[in-house]
Interface confidence: low
């Protein structure tokens, strides 16, 4: 006769508070007659999980039906998994007997242990914008989760970066862990629509990855261009300087006209053209009445933009 | 003689993972003759975790020496504490016999719960600034702390502040926890050396709460006021007018003088004198030549303030 | 570093007043109990009593009831104990403790302060 | 209230020697006992809470436990700056209540 196998196929069972555990266990052979029993432990002090014939489990399920004849699926259901529920479980055989029954083979065991899901990673960027061409660093957190293992991959606009540093901690044994990882991304002039992204795999997430994203608009400042040029004009004794000012990101614009130094006028941009990258362009002009001027002209388009110092482009006009 | 207790003084001991834990009994007799076991659960399937006669328990260790002849102390120490371990453990007394001794009376029971202490909590403030006599919201985040129980107090320079609300989730059994927490905060004109404190306390940490702090300059504009005055003048061709910008926060301020409308200047403040509450004062000066007006001259001094909408106070200049 | 600074040496006399104070730094004030204990010359340690600053909740030992008198000014973190009618007995260091808001083992009679040494004399 | 009996009240030893002292609880108080260190200038340091809690910062070379209603403090290997004033402390209930105190005298 076939030797009889104790089949408990998962070496480790990850659960979650609250859950239902399935511990599988099958057998190759109805013999030798006797009761298949689950104890978590070994040795004197193992603890009976799952008896059939006495005892009271209300926590605990059967797969299948033990009462039909050739049954050899002996699986249970643990439900409302605690903490206190963790430990190594044994599907164990006994032999009929008398008085009473006797071990006769035990499976390998089936290690239950606690998992938790990470939170949903939270992505934070600078504190202060900066220029395309410099570097800024990107913050990705995610806490709760349980067992440490865990894999984190940084995106911008779907490509991957190798350039960040990742810490899990607590170092030592811990009931749940958190990450922290920190991204340096090079920003360039086209950034304004680009986003990082955090990727958080765990075993908890059975393959769905939880993603954090952060917008490079909230981290990039694009300076404007700027370019003076004279209009025509019909009118004889004026002239039409226009100042455009391009590609530049955030919004906040103002512009001052000076005449050989001297403050013309004062603007702040608002109805602005938005080009495709996402910056913005803006156009100022200034009719100068070249009557009132005996000598040639420097105009200057000064303008400040987001706070930061201001950038500025001159014109000469000169008077025939 | 006296009836034997078994004295288990704690009802729960909280416990981290890796460290050791205590289980104290002691007992208030020596008879009956027998030994004193440790087990883990009731019934038929409670899990022995120490018989000094035999077995092997190598995490296990006695307080005092049970081979001495009068000790009435058998409490244990558990190294290396897992989330396996958690359960209630009971110190059971049994008689001596034969063939096999008799279980005589149980402790109470002590519960071995499992702690984690909350990560240092994380507090943050409003994106935008905004003015005194308004409210702002400040978070705090703490995470990874069991059991779930845990008191956030917020203050406000150490006085507690009462409109916030708290949420501690998941809201189920989890194997950790966080909090998460908003609190309301009207901003007064004195607030730019403020400070907002997250306190949080937790059994884990034994008496000394966490903090975390925001400071309120980051999340204040206190707009200036402005007065427009004319100073004496020795030449009498010019008038003095200085303009007074004062109790001001934060820096960035941009000053244009009009005359009768006309741009006549436009400076940014640089050199600023700061006031005890932290706030700025700043003055600017327009010379104004008399004689190029034959008319009265209406002086405006406008300031836009951290990007703000502009404000202004006008001087009406009398041209004698 | 949590720190309790006490006020310096008093010499008092009989019949009189005298008012201590106790500074706390380095954590908030309002999360303990500030408890005050009392050492004779030459003597062993007794507990007087603890107020709490939160709402000025005060637990007195029965002995020196009507003898201490427990206040405190939160907006300075700062504990004050005004022993009454002194009399030679009240000769002592006083020192302050103190223990956190929820009964936690850790929290109790952790940090002191050094003392502040009364001499009730003619 | 309750009382704590503190012994011996003095006690000479030498340097290395290890020596423990005592303090009964007059009810019971579970474990809510602690040891304190008071410096000659005064300066007063908790050891032990909880009975046998060893308080960050102080040598492995002091333990607390407890018999019943007897709780001890041992100093396995005495050091110079070990010879200094030790008093046991209840937070149990209402009034807290001291030891009377144990003096360590080197010999």
């Known amino acids: 006769e076939e030797e009889l196998q104790m089949i408990q196929p998962e070496k480790l069972l990850l659960v979650t508070v609250g859950k239902t555990a399935t511990l599988h266990c099958t057998v190759t052979s109805l013999l030798p007659v006797g009761p298949v029993l689950w104890f978590r432990g070994v040795g004197p002090g193992r603890e009976l999980i799952y008896n059939q014939k006495e005892g009271h489990f209300p926590r605990v399920t059967t797969v299948s039906d033990l009462t039909k004849r050739n049954n050899m699926d002996f699986s249970i259901r643990i439900s409302s998994i605690t903490p206190a529920d963790v430990g190594t479980y044994y599907c164990v055989k006994f032999r009929k007997g008398s008085p009473e029954n006797v071990e006769f083979k035990s499976g390998p065991g089936t290690e239950m242990a606690l998992g938790a899901k990470p939170s949903a990673p939270v992505v934070s960027g600078p504190a202060v914008r900066a220029t395309p061409e410099h570097t800024v660093s990107f913050t990705c957190e995610s806490h709760g989760f349980s067992p440490r293992d865990i894999t984190l991959k940084w995106f911008k606009n779907g490509n991957e970066l190798s350039d960040f540093q990742t810490n899990v901690d607590p170092a030592g044994d811990s009931v749940s862990y958190s990450i922290h990882s920190t991204a340096r991304v090079v920003l360039t002039r086209g950034d304004v629509h680009s986003q990082v992204i955090c990727e958080i795999a765990h075993i908890t997430l059975q393959g769905d990855p939880l993603r954090g994203t952060a917008n490079l608009s909230e981290a990039i400042r694009v300076p404007p261009t700027l370019e003076v040029t004279q209009q025509p004009m019909r009118a004889e004794n004026q002239a039409n300087v226009t100042c455009q000012v391009s590609n530049f990101y955030p919004r906040g614009l103002q512009l001052t006209w000076l005449e050989n130094g001297n403050v013309s006028r004062t603007e702040t941009a608002s109805t602005l053209i938005e080009n495709k990258d996402g910056t913005y362009n803006w156009m100022s002009w200034l009719l100068v009445n070249t009557c009132a001027h005996r000598d040639d002209v420097v105009l200057t388009c000064q303008v400040e933009h987001d706070g930061q110092q201001a950038v500025s482009k001159s014109y000469a006009l000169e008077i025939s | 003689e006296e009836e034997l207790q078994m004295i288990q003084p704690e009802k729960l001991l909280l416990v981290t993972v890796g460290k050791t834990a205590t289980l104290h009994c002691t007992v208030t007799s020596l008879l009956p003759v027998g030994p004193v076991l440790w087990f883990r659960g009731v019934g038929p399937g409670r899990e022995l975790i120490y018989n000094q006669k035999e077995g092997h328990f190598p995490r296990v260790t006695t307080v005092s020496d049970l081979t001495k002849r009068n000790n009435m102390d058998f409490s244990i120490r558990i190294s290396s504490i897992t989330p396996a371990d958690v359960g209630t453990y009971y110190c059971v007394k049994f008689r001596k016999g034969s063939p096999e001794n008799v279980e005589f009376k149980s402790g109470p029971g002590t519960e071995m719960a499992l702690g984690a202490k909350p990560s240092a909590p994380v507090v943050s403030g409003p994106a935008v600034r905004a003015t005194p006599e308004h409210t702002v919201s400040f978070t705090c985040e703490s995470h990874g702390f069991s059991p779930r129980d845990i008191t956030l107090k917020w203050f406000k320079n150490g006085n507690e502040l009462s409109d916030f609300q708290t949420n501690v989730d998941p809201a189920g059994d989890s194997v950790s926890y966080s909090i998460h927490s908003t609190a309301r905060v009207v901003l007064t004109r004195g607030d730019v050396h403020s400070q907002v404190i997250c306190e949080i306390a937790h059994i884990t940490l034994q008496g000394d709460p966490l903090r975390g702090t925001a400071n309120l300059s980051e999340a204040i504009r206190v707009p200036p006021t402005l007065e427009v005055t004319q100073q004496p003048m020795r030449a009498e061709n010019q008038a003095n007018v200085t303009c007074q910008v004062s109790n001001f926060y934060p820096r960035g301020l941009q000053l244009t003088w009009l005359e009768n409308g006309n741009v006549s200047r436009t400076e940014t403040a640089s050199t600023l004198i700061e006031n005890k509450d932290g706030t700025y004062n700043w003055m600017s000066w327009l010379l104004v030549n008399t004689c190029a007006h034959r008319d009265d001259v209406v002086l405006t001094c406008q300031v836009e303030h951290d990007g703000q909408q502009a404000v202004s106070k006008s001087y009406a200049l009398e041209i004698s | 570093e949590v720190q309790f600074q006490q006020s310096g040496t008093v010499l008092a006399r009989p019949g009189t007043s005298v008012k201590m104070s106790c500074k706390a730094s380095?954590?908030?004030?309002?999360?303990?109990?500030m408890h005050w204990v009392k050492q004779g010359p030459g003597q062993g340690l007794q507990w007087i009593g603890a107020?709490?600053?939160?709402?000025?909740?005060?637990t007195y030992n029965q002995k020196f009831k009507g003898k201490a008198e427990l206040t405190v000014v939160t907006s300075t973190s700062t504990a004050y104990m005004e022993v009454s009618s002194l009399t030679n007995e009240d000769s002592a260091v006083y020192y302050c403790?103190?223990?956190?808001?929820?009964?936690?083992?850790?929290?109790?009679?952790?940090?002191w302060g050094q003392g502040t040494l009364v001499t009730v004399s003619a | 209230d309750i009382q704590m009996t503190q012994s011996p009240s003095s006690l000479s030893a030498s340097l290395g020697e290890r020596v423990s002292l005592t303090c009964r609880a007059s009810?019971?108080?579970?474990?809510?006992l602690n040891w304190l260190q008071q410096e000659p200038d005064g300066t007063i340091k908790r050891l032990i809470y909880?009975?046998?809690s060893l308080d960050s910062g102080v040598p492995k070379r002091f333990s607390g436990s407890r018999s019943g209603s007897d709780y001890s403090l041992t100093i396995s290997g005495l050091e110079s700056e070990d010879f200094v004033d030790y008093y046991c402390?209840?937070?149990?209930?209402?009034?807290?209540?001291f030891g009377g105190g144990t003096k360590l005298e080197i010999n």
């Open positions: 403790t103190r223990s956190f808001y929820y009964s936690l083992d850790a929290a109790w009679f952790v940090y």
């Open positions: 107020i709490y600053p939160v709402n000025n909740d005060t």
């Open positions: 380095g954590s908030t004030f309002t999360s303990y109990w």
């Open positions: 402390l209840q937070y149990a209930s209402s009034p807290f209540t």
């Open positions: 009810q019971d108080i579970g474990s809510r």
């Open positions: 909880a009975t046998s």
